[in-house]
Interface confidence: low
């Protein structure tokens, strides 16, 4: 019988008392084969973290700073359940740390030196740790003691709880630096008042502070937020302009064998029986003998953290950067005006080989990071382990939902002004063998399908989105008799046609021979009835243009396109017979790397782009013998996006809506994780 006990860690006598009450009340409402609670008492949260890591306890609730400590080796804990605040309909699991300024003050985030600052309190998250952590490498050296460096950075501050004797500048705007509400500039509202009164130029608070202090929109409009990209935004645009997004209070568990499903089962049942307004005799979110015992008193319930989410992703790049800077106190030796090498994310072995060749040729401007799947690459870019990669539109959507931005677009047509003119897109098509003359768009049920990969534009999102509108369910593996859609569950009929060997079968990378455009077309040639690819795929792999044995004798005339009106047309008539227009592949990165990725990639394409005529003796960025490694092989140049610099603007309203509809069918664990951070 599996042990269904969750050992909860308590950090005080009062918490232990509440934990025992929790245990006893859960026993009274949960069947004997359900989850149960045991209580373990430790002296501190750090002791609890160590106990969970050592398998002496299973769970504890922590604030964000401690979630970071819990994640660090050797603890390796992960977030499993989040407390939420507000309503069940609009649950808030995060708050945003922001920098608020007056509208007419005219400076940006990178011009804070010499300004006057208002803080909620020394050592507090939104008011000190996050802003000072993010500014850390701009502080004058020596950076220790930190308070002295901060005092020398700003021209005057109010940082309640600071030592006014040793660091008088930190108390210049609020004499005495009192550490309670007796100091009018203490806490969130106090820091905002410090700005409002004109004592300071910037207030470091959380996003709700300004709304709590100014009910009138006209008053709020006198203030703006400083963004990390050195722009400003209105105060209600905090989701797109903040210093960090911070989880409020989170249950953590071991990453391996951590009982996360059991912990969720326990807490889900606990909130049903003892949540807000549920029971008189025991309340989960109430602390008669103290404050915030086990859980925050202000919490309204729990949400399960998606399993794909590790602590780094949960805490977010900005928060982790800020806390790491403060804890480790290390800054890069390079000055801020130098671009560090761009860490390119390469998928599997073949892309890594090409990337390494690029790295050597780039004289250290490009470094390579490997991952097994596109989603793993996106996650690495999010957390700073990698910086950039070029993505199909379907993954540009996921990357965008995860906070990344498009920076350059692949262009596929030769033009005089290639780099300045991003194209409208390419065509997603359905290809069949000419010999299968009875096959149309309307009778694909039961046929064998070939897809570039799950989640990609031409191979999945467009055809499956159209299909979903017809069949109104997500069971595509039942619609087709079998197929190859790399990235599907291994036991799915949509992995049956795939050709990868062993663990590589149906993997969404080049180890699966039927992956990507060329792979999906090969699948059609060798096994399938229909392939969902781009309009250039057939001509690129027929007429001897692809020398591989399976392709060298193929003839374009032996293939036709399926049109949505039920007719068929020759391959060259794609403009009048396609499923939809697809956005070109685009390079994505984090917002903070946007300028450098843009600059270095433009340098790189001048050196190794399509102006290189002999690819046998020279490195060519856009060539890989039809394997589309790192970039599509038909890329002519990487083009500026001009104002299409967000994923929504880049992909266009129509495509975003189409992918949004397909989200009900999404198997993307990363998309689930990212929409948890930003619904």
């Amino acid at each position: 019988v599996p042990d269904k006990t969750v050992r909860w860690c308590a950090v005080s006598e009062h918490e232990a008392t509440k934990c025992q009450s929790f245990r006893d009340h859960m026993k009274s409402v949960i069947p004997s084969d359900g989850p149960s609670v045991a209580c373990v008492k430790k002296a501190s949260y750090l002791d609890c973290i160590r106990a969970i890591a050592a398998n002496e306890a299973d769970a504890v609730t922590l604030d964000a700073g401690l979630v970071y400590d819990a994640y660090l080796a050797p603890n390796n804990l992960k977030p499993v359940v989040a407390e939420f605040y507000g309503s069940k309909e609009d649950p808030q699991t995060f708050y945003y740390a922001v920098a608020v300024v007056k509208k007419d003050s005219g400076f940006q985030m990178n011009q804070l030196r010499g300004k006057k600052s208002c803080h909620t309190g020394l050592g507090r998250s939104a008011g000190w740790n996050i802003p000072i952590g993010l500014l850390y490498c701009d502080l004058p050296e020596p950076r220790k003691p930190l308070e002295k460096a901060v005092a020398n950075f700003f021209s005057g501050s109010c940082a309640p709880c600071a030592d006014g004797t040793d660091f008088p500048q930190l108390c210049q705007l609020c004499p005495g630096c009192g550490c309670s509400t007796l100091n009018q500039y203490f806490g969130y509202s106090g820091a905002f008042k410090c700005l409002k009164d004109g004592a300071g130029d910037v207030a470091f608070v959380k996003h709700s502070t300004i709304f709590e202090n100014l009910a009138n929109k006209a008053d709020r409009d006198q203030y703006e937020l400083l963004c990390l990209d050195n722009t400003r935004k209105p105060v209600d645009e905090y989701k797109d302009c903040h210093l960090a997004q911070v989880p409020s209070h989170t249950v953590v568990a071991r990453s391996m064998g951590g009982k996360e499903d059991l912990i969720w089962e326990l807490l889900n049942q606990a909130q049903e029986h003892f949540g807000k307004d549920k029971s008189k005799e025991f309340q989960l979110f109430s602390s008669p003998h103290g404050k915030d015992l086990l859980f925050k008193d202000s919490a309204h319930g729990f949400l399960k953290v998606p399993p794909r989410m590790d602590a780094k992703m949960y805490l977010g790049y900005e928060y982790v950067t800020a806390i790491r800077n403060l804890r480790e106190g290390t800054c890069p030796e390079a000055p801020t005006d130098e671009c560090k090498p761009v860490k390119w994310c390469a998928l599997s072995h073949h892309e890594r080989l090409k990337c390494d060749e690029w790295s050597v040729n780039s004289v250290g401007k490009i470094e390579c990071v490997s991952a097994e799947t596109t989603e793993d690459c996106i996650a690495k870019i999010m957390n700073g382990e990698a910086d950039a990669m070029s993505l199909d539109g379907g993954f540009v959507y996921i990357a965008g939902k995860c906070g990344l931005v498009p920076v350059l677009a692949e262009n596929y047509n030769k033009s005089d002004n290639c780099e300045d003119t991003p194209e409208a897109g390419y065509f997603a098509i359905a290809v069949v063998k000419k010999s299968a003359s009875d096959l149309t768009w309307d009778n694909l049920k039961g046929k064998k399908s070939c897809h570039t990969a799950v989640g990609r534009t031409a191979g999945w999102n467009i055809p499956m989105g159209l299909l979903y509108n017809k069949i109104n369910h997500c069971r595509f593996d039942e619609f087709f008799s079998e197929g190859c859609a790399p990235g599907s569950k291994k036991d799915s009929s949509l992995c049956k046609l795939c050709m990868g060997s062993g663990l590589n079968l149906c993997e969404p990378n080049n180890k699966e021979g039927y992956y990507g455009y060329t792979g999906a077309f090969r699948c059609l040639v060798e096994k399938g009835d229909v392939a969902f690819v781009k309009h250039q795929t057939v001509p690129q792999n027929t007429g001897g243009k692809n020398p591989d044995p399976w392709a060298k004798n193929l003839n374009e005339k032996d293939y036709e396109l399926l049109c949505l009106d039920g007719t068929r047309k020759p391959v060259e008539e794609y403009a009048n017979c396609h499923l939809a227009r697809a956005p070109n592949h685009a390079v994505v990165t984090r917002k903070d790397k946007e300028a450098c990725v843009h600059k270095i990639l433009r340098q790189q394409q001048h050196l190794f782009g399509s102006n290189v005529t002999d690819c046998s003796g020279n490195f060519c960025l856009f060539r890989s013998e039809t394997k589309d490694l790192l970039f599509r092989d038909d890329t002519v140049c990487l083009a500026k996006l001009h104002d299409r610099n967000t994923y929504e603007k880049y992909l266009g309203e129509e495509y975003v809506k189409a992918v949004g509809n397909l989200r009900k069918c999404s198997t993307s664990s990363l998309l689930e994780a990212c929409t948890f951070r930003r619904p």
Epitope: T336, D337, E338, G364, K599
Partner: nanobody, 117 residues
Amino acid sequence: EVQLVESGGGLVQPGGSLRLSCAASGSIFSIATMAWYRQAPGKGLEWVAGITRSGSTNYRDSVKGRFTISRDNSKNTMYLQMNSLRAEDTAVYYCTDYSSRYYHDYWGQGTLVTVSS
């Protein structure tokens, strides 16, 4: 303000040698990856060789084995030793920091190398 000054160009016969120097003022030199570029008459700019701050080097194929890039961080100077020169090496040679942010590249005024008999 960073300044880069190239010198050492001149007229040389095919098969001959030249040594170009690039002197950098300002702090950029000790931390940046440096590179030599060249521009032949009527042609576009092309990368010739690069050297990282730790001394790793790389060359375009057509100059490999003939040209050697080096740097002396204590003197804030980079060099390009060019041996077995050919007519097609005729160009204005520029040094650059190859890596500064937000498009503010630092370029010297160039030094002309003419290979002719």
